[in-house]
Amino acid sequence: VPRWRQQWSGPGTTKRFPETVLARCVKYTEIHPEMRHVDCQSVWDAFKGAFISKHPCNITEEDYQPLMKLGTQTVPCNKILLWSRIKDLAHQFTQVQRDMFTLEDTLLGYLADDLTWCGEFNTSKINYQSCPDWRKDCSNNPVSVFWKTVSRRFAEAACDVVHVMLNGSRSKIFDKNSTFGSVEVHNLQPEKVQTLEAWVIHGGREDSRDLCQDPTIKELESIISKRNIQFSCKNIYRPDKFLQCVKNPEDSSCTSEI
């Protein structure tokens, strides 16, 4: 008799999820000698232990603590790049500027990037059919809780000048409900972080507006200022040229505004 299985609104666990996590862990630790001590089998066991046999709407940050402990990593706290709704450009930037780190350039972020996972209450099975959707089902699902946990820790680790890349093409350039707006902004430590510098990335070729004057950016500035952190903002009018100038800063065309 086939067992009744909960149908969730979101996509199921990414196929070959265990193999993908393990392979990514091995690859990451090969590339980063400072993480060579990490036992990837133990990392997978801790990852699995966070959600297997648990109701996928009842996951807590506590469930991920063994994984957090194993994945503890020291990144230069003054080289952190946060992003919101513009992941690809942020990653293209750190591909070139390798002394800077997005969350996905850390071991735990790298392991989980673009993956989905969940289990089922009281069975050791991974659910490859469906997983809870944050809006339609529940917010305390394995994926959302994971990203909330690692994002909080990443923001807490930041110091000096923290950069954030924001998508100037969105109706809400700064969105209070994004991970950046709801988690990272509130976990920057005022005693360590001097300035949050926003880079607003323009979408249109002919868009010469000063998006740093956008009401949502002013809202971000207000939140940050109330937390005793300075705020600055830059328009990146041409992201293609911006990346090119990161690659070749000596280029004569890179002295003008980008």
């Epitope: 990451y28 090969e30 591909q95 390798r98 790298y110 690659k247």
Partner: nanobody, 128 residues
Framework: DVQLQESGGGLVQAGDSLRLSCAAS????????IGWFRQAPGKEREFVAG????????LYSDSVKGRFTISRDNDKNTAYLQMNSLKPEDTALYYC?????????????????????WGKGTLVTVSS
């Protein structure tokens, strides 16, 4: 573009040590895998040792394994080749070369034809 400048060569006795440096100018030294090559008089240029952008992978030719150590300091834009127990057959012009490497691609093959930038070389002479 990346410019590479080797230094540290010289005349030594067999059994001695030398440390070669490869100083890079230009941006993003840490985007490149670095290889050391050498060319002995009348011979083809050959691969000696290589290091990935993050120092995660090291490669050595069989002839230098256990005697030479490659390293790099990305903050100083410099790669090094520590050469111990030198032999007369290590006499050659030593070149460093750079090859772009993806951030999350750990494998690399430092073939001579795949190298994008070369230094002018530093001469190492080992007398018996």
């Amino acid at each position: 573009d990346v410019q590479l400048q080797e230094s540290g060569g010289g005349l030594v006795q067999a059994g001695d040590s030398l440390r070669l440096s490869c100083a890079a100018s230009g941006p993003h030294f840490n985007n490149y895998a670095i290889g050391w090559f050498r060319q002995a008089p009348g011979k083809e240029r050959e691969f000696v040792a290589g290091i990935s952008w993050s120092s995660g992978s090291l490669l050595y030719s069989d002839s230098v394994k256990g005697r030479f150590t490659i390293s790099r300091d990305n903050d100083k834009n410099t790669a090094y080749l520590q050469m111990n127990s030198l032999k007369p057959e290590d006499t050659a012009l030593y070149y460093c070369a750079a090859q772009y490497q993806e951030r999350y691609y750990s494998d690399f093959s430092l073939k001579e034809k795949g190298m994008e930038y070369w230094g002018k070389g530093t001469l190492v002479t080992v007398s018996s």
